[in-house]
């Protein structure tokens, strides 16, 4: 549970200003932009020559509760004719974002942040390696 | 600034206690699996049927500071001779994430939560629609 | 980081079956490319099959497709290989390989391997 090195300057008061009470900062209510959503997909997940299913993980303390993970259908990619072709493989594309993990003893309530990787959908590409008989 | 409806119950504590001064929370130093990194891509970017470029965006109060976008290359995809197929797409894959907002009036720093659309890769799919001769 | 660990291998009578499993430890199995590989006494390693990440694709090498059947729960993280007439020639140490490429997998240059179980088929 560090904090990364540029973590570590972001977090700090300027210089010039008396420390931070070690341990927490102040947290205002609201997010900013909340309303900002990806636009409407058009099945992109099924249509892709790389096509992706999704599974949503749900936690009650963890903001958002809700993350959806994808997991590639196909180790290789779909051609033209709708057929797996594994000369080219299908590959995941992962994002990291941070979360919001909510932490109560009795009454006592705290938040943190806590990064988490989630695979966003897939992609097709051309493999690196070639057996070579 | 609004919180979403997931968030207003999210952020407040169990009926039984003390509700919480309006407008703030406890935000506790230090983020959880901080360490977790995306596996080494492998120039997946490069290699993709819907190759991408990335671009580095930069906010001092912005945690964390640098956060990259990628841009689709191609409006078609690259077939196996290395052409554009322009009967295939590139279409962008993005996701919600959420970062951290430093604000500052002297020497009072507070934090507020942050929705960001990050596009974070590309992937090659059939056109929903074709043109007719 | 995915770190793995095989179970369920052990000494087996020719014409026998055995469910051998590898259990995942990582957030991101889902996202692995899983597979099993073997290796007999003074040969190299041999690919067995792989699953993709969802499940949904699954492709053997093509001495196997008859006999091993390979699944996976991504739920509990866990990759399975169930093998049948179990032959003399099927003993072997068996790995569960993860990668998030297939075409690393195949070829043996997976990202993660697990430690293997040894699988002896008597006559």
């Known amino acids: 549970q560090r904090v990364p090195k540029e973590g570590q300057t972001f977090f700090q008061k300027p210089e010039s200003c008396p420390s931070v009470p070690e341990g927490s900062l102040k947290l205002d209510l609201g997010i900013i932009n909340a309303n900002q959503r990806v636009p409407l997909s058009r099945n992109i997940e099924r249509r892709s020559t790389s096509p992706w299913n999704y599974t949503v993980t749900w936690d009650p303390n963890r903001y958002p509760s809700e993350v959806v993970q994808a997991q590639c259908r196909h180790l290789g990619c779909v051609n033209a004719q709708g057929k797996e072709d594994i000369f080219m493989n299908s590959v995941p594309i992962q994002q990291e974002t941070l979360v919001l993990r909510r932490k109560h003893q009795g009454c006592s309530v705290s938040f943190q942040l806590e990064k988490l990787l989630v695979t966003v959908g897939c992609t097709c590409v051309k493999p690196l390696i070639h057996h070579v008989h | 600034q609004r919180v979403p409806k997931e968030g207003q119950t999210f952020f407040q504590k169990p009926e039984s206690c003390p509700s919480v001064p309006e407008g703030s929370l406890k935000l506790d130093l230090g983020i959880i699996n901080a360490n977790q990194r995306v596996p080494l891509s492998r120039n997946i970017e490069r290699r993709s049927t819907s190759p991408w470029n990335y671009t580095v965006t930069w906010d001092p109060n912005r945690y964390p500071s640098e956060v990259v976008q990628a841009q689709c290359r191609h409006l078609g995809c690259v077939n196996a001779q290395g052409k554009e197929d322009i009967f295939m797409n590139s279409v962008p894959i993005q996701q919600e994430t959420l970062v951290l907002r430093r604000k500052h009036q002297g020497c009072s720093v507070s934090f507020q939560l942050e929705k960001l659309l990050v596009t974070v890769g590309c992937t090659c799919v059939k056109p929903l629609i074709h043109h007719v001769h | 980081e995915v770190q793995l660990v095989e179970s369920g291998g052990g000494l087996v009578q020719a014409g026998g079956s055995l469910r051998l499993s590898c259990a995942a430890s990582?957030?991101?199995?889902?996202?692995?490319?899983v597979g099993w590989f073997r290796q007999a006494p003074g040969k190299e390693r041999e690919f067995i099959g792989a699953i993709s990440g969802s499940g949904d694709s699954i492709y053997y090498a093509v001495s196997e497709k008859d006999r091993f059947t390979i699944s996976r729960d991504n739920g509990k993280n866990t990759l399975y290989l169930q093998m049948s007439s179990l032959k003399a020639e099927d003993t072997a140490v068996y790995y569960c390989t993860a990668d998030q490429e297939f075409g690393y997998l195949r070829f043996g240059r997976s990202e993660y391997w697990g430690q293997g179980t040894q699988v002896t088929v008597s006559s």
């Open positions: 990582g957030r991101t199995f889902s996202s692995y490319v």
